[in-house]
Amino acid sequence: ECGHISVSAPIVHLGDPITASCIIKQNCSHLDPEPQILWRLGAELQPGGRQQRLSDGTQESIITLPHLNHTQAFLSCALNWGNSLQILDQVELRAGYPPAIPHNLSCLMNLTTSSLICQWEPGPETHLPTSFTLKSFKSRGNCQTQGDSILDCVPKDGQSHCSIPRKHLLLYQNMGIWVQAENALGTSMSPQLCLDPMDVVKLEPPMLRTMDPSPEAAPPQAGCLQLSWEPWQPGLHINQKCELRHKPQRGEASWALVGPLPLEALQYELCGLLPATAYTLQIRCIRWPLPGHWSDWSPSLELRTTERAPTHHHHHHHH
């Protein structure tokens, strides 16, 4: 190797200056005694290199790029060799930003997968490889005192969520949770959440069903629907409130909300609807009165209201 580049920093803030030095060894005898060292950033030649001969006979060129405005580029030093440019050495330069503070960190406890799933917004693009780590610890109190640390949760590349498995969780006990973002230019941390995994539980919705008509029960009135629901069994012991939404299948009507309904109602007569009309219905539930997240809306149930009972009109004929 005849030449070697060293840089003040290979990774800098976007727009910051960068200084580089290229040294050519004396024993490169096939070179001119006073070779002119050229600089190139990407495909563009860069003026402004200051060249000097050092006491040991090596040649050095120093260049300062006032603003590195490329997020990634190769800086090379070269010599004119005949009619072509002979590259002596090159380095990769990167420029970007330190990570912004991750924000909107939120978590939900999934009782089916037995894991606490946390997600966040990473903030603006840094243009640099940036790693995110979900960090947490167990705490007996309100997270002012740190208990056992929990194994870091590292999301897959490009993902802004991570799942803490059950073996690292303690239900009905607070956990401190935060996201740490790190790249070559710095580290940032989100504000810490302090939560009991059960307080962010997201239940599965009940299954809506048509109510089986029983011989002794009166049929639904016109504009009414009789429906029932089957609670999600594993969440049965969690006190919940639920809400229904419905809309006619035809037309552009928006959803109408009915609730709150206690989970234990298990059956319901919905009235005030249009007669002889097909409706789409869904239900969802939330842990209540304790904190929790709304479940997703259940799969739709499609039901039709009964016809209006025929009314007898007396027609008066006027002669």
Epitope: L111, S114, K167, L171, P234, H237, I238, E264
Partner: antibody
């Protein structure tokens, strides 16, 4: 401190009836599912029945369905088990229990013995 | 109905031993598996809920693991007060079922 105190056990003839009570204190009774678990002499634990916080959901073990009725009075903080058509195989210590949100039996009473014998 | 099979039905061990009891569900129950300890003439006591969560006041030598169908209760170093009968219970769906019990006796 949570306390569950069962009463109403005793000796009863086959075909007879008995009503067990469980007086609860030390927690907000109306917010929790409650249940009954029994244990025949020298045998393991057997779930009998549970009741939701407001009493609307009442699952039963097949072995007692149609004969036993679980109920609660939230104003009195009391759980009940009405046992009819009793059989010799219903002989057991009956425990009243408070359920946690994930269905575990969190707190237990000391138990009351029901003996069905002629 | 979900059946719970516990093994062994009894075991003999010495103070300081590591003891493992297993419980198998006839179908997947996620993490809805609870463990209880019962001493003669006493009511059962909750040790572990939701497969691995230690109930308040229970010594840390007790631990639970597993999910789906296979679960384990481990006592890392058996103490004199641990000689008792242990039961597992599924709370995933009704009817709730207990395992047959494991009696831990002094060797």
């Amino acid at each position: 401190e949570v306390q569950l105190l069962e009463s109403g056990g005793g000796l009863v003839q086959p075909g007879g009836s008995l009503r067990l009570s469980c007086a609860a204190s030390g927690f907000t009774f109306s917010l929790y599912w409650m249940g009954w678990v029994r244990q025949a002499p020298g045998k393991g634990l057997e779930w009998v029945s549970s009741i939701s916080s407001s009493g609307g959901v009442t699952p039963y073990a097949d072995s007692v369905k149609g004969r036993f009725t679980i109920s609660r009075d939230n104003s009195k903080n009391t759980l009940y088990l009405q046992m009819n058509s009793l059989r010799a195989e219903d002989t057991a210590v009956y425990y009243c229990a408070k359920l946690g949100e994930l269905g575990f039996f969190q707190e237990w009473g000391q138990g009351t013995l029901v003996t069905v014998s002629s | 109905d979900i059946q719970m099979t516990q093994s062994p039905s009894s075991l003999s061990a010495s103070v300081g031993d590591r003891v493992t009891i297993t419980c198998r569900a006839s179908q997947g129950i996620s993490s809805y598996l609870n463990w209880y300890q019962q001493k003669p003439g006493k009511a059962p006591k909750l040790l572990i809920y939701y497969a691995s969560n230690l109930q308040n006041g229970v010594p840390s030598r007790f631990s639970g693991s597993g999910s789906g169908t296979d679960f384990t209760l481990t006592i890392s170093s058996l103490q004199p007060e641990d000689f008792a009968t242990y039961y597992c219970q599924q709370s995933y769906a009704y009817p709730q079922q207990f395992g047959g019990g494991t009696k831990v006796e002094i060797k």
